[in-house]
Interface confidence: low
């Protein structure tokens, strides 16, 4: 009891003068509390508490429930305090069967005795299961058992209370340890997609995934560089333990242009913060923008192969395509496909596959291409170069030698004399004319040139060489010249 | 329990057709990305075919596009993959797979099946 | 298409030793990188995801570093379970794995 010193204020004292006192059960409690500045009697057990305005408490017939600690308070309010057991055989344990602990920390399973002098005061698991290794408790009579760090490995977990008592084991009823998980890692957060892209008057719907281990995270909407309050819609899930899911929706029922912008799904929790966002981007009508991937004037040799490759952007998606020659749609030899597979793709690829191409196939090559919104085309001019190839080698009435070749690009003609002992032409000799005689024709295709050479200035045997070439490659044609007496007796053209 | 079941898999010739199931059990089927991941013998894992939990969007390996089809059946919590046109390179196990997803559209495969095998041969 | 390329092909150590295991892309993933372990006759297992975050229920003894095109999963002190055959795998662009690394006991 606390000793009185005069001139302070002293607490009050308890009669018996014990701090803890046994009772049987059915036995009477009666407490005196001695000052004479009494205000009241205050009674504790577990969340219960009761008050008492008489300097005496009386209780006639005690039961178990009665135990616990009782406490006297002066006007001063200075206290003092009695614990009372009351040893009832049939109830040694008072249960408050919540048991919530919080991850990392302690937490009380509330079962106090009825009797202190009981031994082997400890927690036992249910149906004789062994307590995890790791689990550390503390017993204290008056409060009950303490678990040391609860970790999240013990959440279920089932368990007495356990005391000896004559001998025999007993066990209280039965307590779950529910486990409030820590956030040791910051909320991950995922959106359904990166980017929209949408025509005014869509919907505009993003689904904000936001996975914790538990539903105390906080998560919410934000556009960037804006105050205003976003409406959002939210489900969630508890997948199994500590395996926490909440979508949270967000929509503009009928999205504007100024409506574009960042938005923001933010979520953070005790350890930290994430966050991540999505682009909207509203346009007043669909879009289709071209990009060739080569050249559109294309040199290609004769039998060879070439693609021709276009990239473009479609918005909405691309509903008709087509490759066009001559007035003749492609049925095959191209393909087109999404340049990604994303959702919000909205780049694609088309190729033609132009093969073994002949000199008569240059021309205009066009990719057509439409949406709901739009069509856009884009033109190849496509030119096939090929191999000079005399059409004609003639000894006109005039005595003119006369070469025409056809070839693109446009091929030179060359002359050249050799006289008859000679294997090799290499005198050459000047034209006296040349013409390109389809310049104004049509753009693609091959080009004709005609050379003209006077064949009165040859005095000797021999052979004379046209030679037609290009970029491509070289064709020539032979005249053979004889002379008996002083006239040219025969001219044999020959390739 | 997560799980995923396999089936379908078998002996076909070139040429030949094989439709395989997997059979979802454990967690909301409807709300999952799934796929299909292959395993020549002796070789290394190749993704196959993707199909979206929302709009069924499908994504093919490039050697298989055009021959196999992706599908599935929320109701009926399966995934199926319809290959057509069958080649002796298709010889794998073929395994289901859930994707789950982190960031915004990057996806991990987080429960797999145990395989089905497909031979094909003459 | 994203390549994606394993090193080495075989990795022969002691139970409790560390192993260092490499993975390199054609070009920057992004940090979009998972690795998956497969033991013989059972089907893959994620162990990491985003290069470094660690699926649940992995043990702590594995972890991922990384960025751009290069990626590595460690495992600190091998345990006898450990030794398997470990794919990388990219989510940047579709999807493609590497050819695998085989941990093996020494």
């Known amino acids: 009891q606390p000793s009185v010193s005069p001139g302070e204020p002293s607490p009050p004292s308890i009669h018996p003068a014990k701090s803890e006192l046994i009772v049987r059960v059915g036995n009477e409690i009666r407490l005196l509390c001695i000052d004479p500045g009494f205000v009241k009697w205050t009674f504790e057990i577990l969340d219960e508490t009761n008050e008492n305005k008489q300097n005496e408490w009386i209780t006639e017939k005690a039961e178990a429930t009665n135990t616990g600690k009782y406490t006297c308070t002066n006007k001063h309010g200075l206290s003092s305090s009695i614990y009372v057991f009351v040893r009832d055989p049939a109830k040694l344990f008072l249960v408050d069967r919540s048991l919530y602990g919080k991850e990392d920390n302690d937490t009380l399973v509330r079962c106090p005795l009825t009797d202190p002098e009981v031994t082997s005061y400890s927690l036992k698991g249910c149906q004789g299961k062994p307590l995890p290794k790791d689990l550390r408790f503390v017993p204290d009579p008056k409060a009950g058992i303490t678990i040391k760090s609860v970790k999240r490995a013990y959440h279920r977990l089932c368990l007495h209370c356990s005391a000896d008592q004559e001998g025999k084991s007993v066990l209280s009823d039965k307590f779950i340890l529910k486990v409030r998980p820590a956030f040791k890692a910051v909320p991950v957060v995922s959106v359904s997609k990166a980017s929209y892209l949408l025509r005014e008057g869509e919907e505009f719907t993003v689904t904000c995934t936001i996975k914790d281990v538990s539903s105390s995270v906080y998560s919410t909407w934000k556009r960037e560089n804006s105050q205003t309050k976003l409406q959002e819609k939210y489900n969630s899930w508890h997948h199994g333990d500590f395996n926490y899911e909440r979508q949270a929706t967000l929509t503009i029922s009928s999205a504007r242009v100024n409506d574009s912008g960042v938005f923001m799904c933010y979520a953070n929790n005790t350890f930290g913060s994430a966050n991540v966002t999505t682009t909207l981007e509203v346009v007043d009508k669909g879009f289709i923008n071209i990009f060739p991937m080569i050249n559109t004037t294309v040199f290609v040799n004769d039998g060879e192969n070439v693609d021709l490759i276009v990239e473009y952007e479609a918005f909405p998606k691309p509903e008709h395509q087509q490759w066009i020659y001559m007035n003749r749609t492609f049925t095959d030899k191209w393909e087109d496909y999404p340049k990604s597979e994303n959702e919000s793709n909205i780049r694609y690829v088309s190729e033609l596959h132009l093969t073994r191409l002949k000199g008569t196939e240059g021309g205009t090559y066009t990719f057509l291409v439409s949406n709901s919104d739009v069509n856009a085309s884009i033109a190849f001019n496509v030119y096939v170069n090929t191999k000079p190839e005399i059409l004609t080698y003639d000894r006109l009435v005039n005595g003119m030698l006369q070469c025409v070749a056809a070839g693109f690009p446009e091929p030179t003609i060359d002359w050249y004399f050799c006289p008859g002992t000679e294997q090799r032409c290499s005198a050459s000799v000047l034209p006296v004319d040349v013409q390109t005689l389809n310049a104004s024709g049509p753009p693609f295709g091959k080009l004709v040139v005609q050379s003209s050479i006077d064949s009165s200035a040859f005095k000797h045997n021999g052979t004379v060489e046209c030679k037609a070439y290009n970029d491509v490659g070289k064709t020539s044609a032979y005249f053979n010249f004889a002379f008996k007496g002083n006239n040219k007796e025969q001219i044999h053209p020959h390739t | 329990e997560v799980q995923l079941v396999e089936s379908g898999g078998g002996l076909v010739q070139p040429g030949g057709s094989l439709r395989l199931s997997c059979a979802a059990s454990?967690?909301?089927?409807?709300?999952?990305?799934m796929a299909w991941v292959r395993q020549a013998p002796g070789k290394g894992l190749e993704w196959v075919a993707n199909i979206n939990q929302i709009a069924g969007s499908t994504y093919y390996l490039d050697s298989v596009r055009g021959r196999f089809t992706i599908s599935r059946d929320n109701a009926k919590n399966s995934l199926y993959l319809q290959m057509n046109s069958l080649r002796a390179e298709d010889t794998a196990v073929y395994y289901c797979?859930?994707?789950?997803?982190?960031?915004?559209?990057?996806?991990?495969?987080?429960?797999w099946g145990q395989g089905t095998t497909v031979t094909v041969s003459s | 298409e994203i390549v994606m390329t394993q090193s080495p092909a075989t990795l022969s150590l002691s139970p409790g030793e560390r192993a260092t295991l490499s993975c390199r892309a054609s070009q920057d993933i992004s940090n979009y990188l998972n690795w998956y372990q497969q033991k013989p006759g059972q089907a893959p297992r994620l162990l990491i995801y985003?290069?470094?975050r660690l699926q649940s229920g992995i043990p702590a003894r594995f972890s991922g570093s990384g960025s751009g095109t290069d990626y590595t999963l460690t495992i600190s002190s091998l345990e006898p379970e450990d030794f398997a055959v470990y794919y990388c795998?990219?989510?940047?662009?579709?999807?493609?794995f590497g050819g695998g690394t085989k941990v093996e006991i020494k």
């Open positions: 795998q990219q989510g940047k662009k579709l999807w493609s």
């Open positions: 797979a859930r994707g789950d997803y982190y960031g915004t559209t990057y996806w991990y495969f987080d429960v």
């Open positions: 454990g967690f909301t089927f409807s709300d999952y990305y």
């Open positions: 985003y290069t470094s």
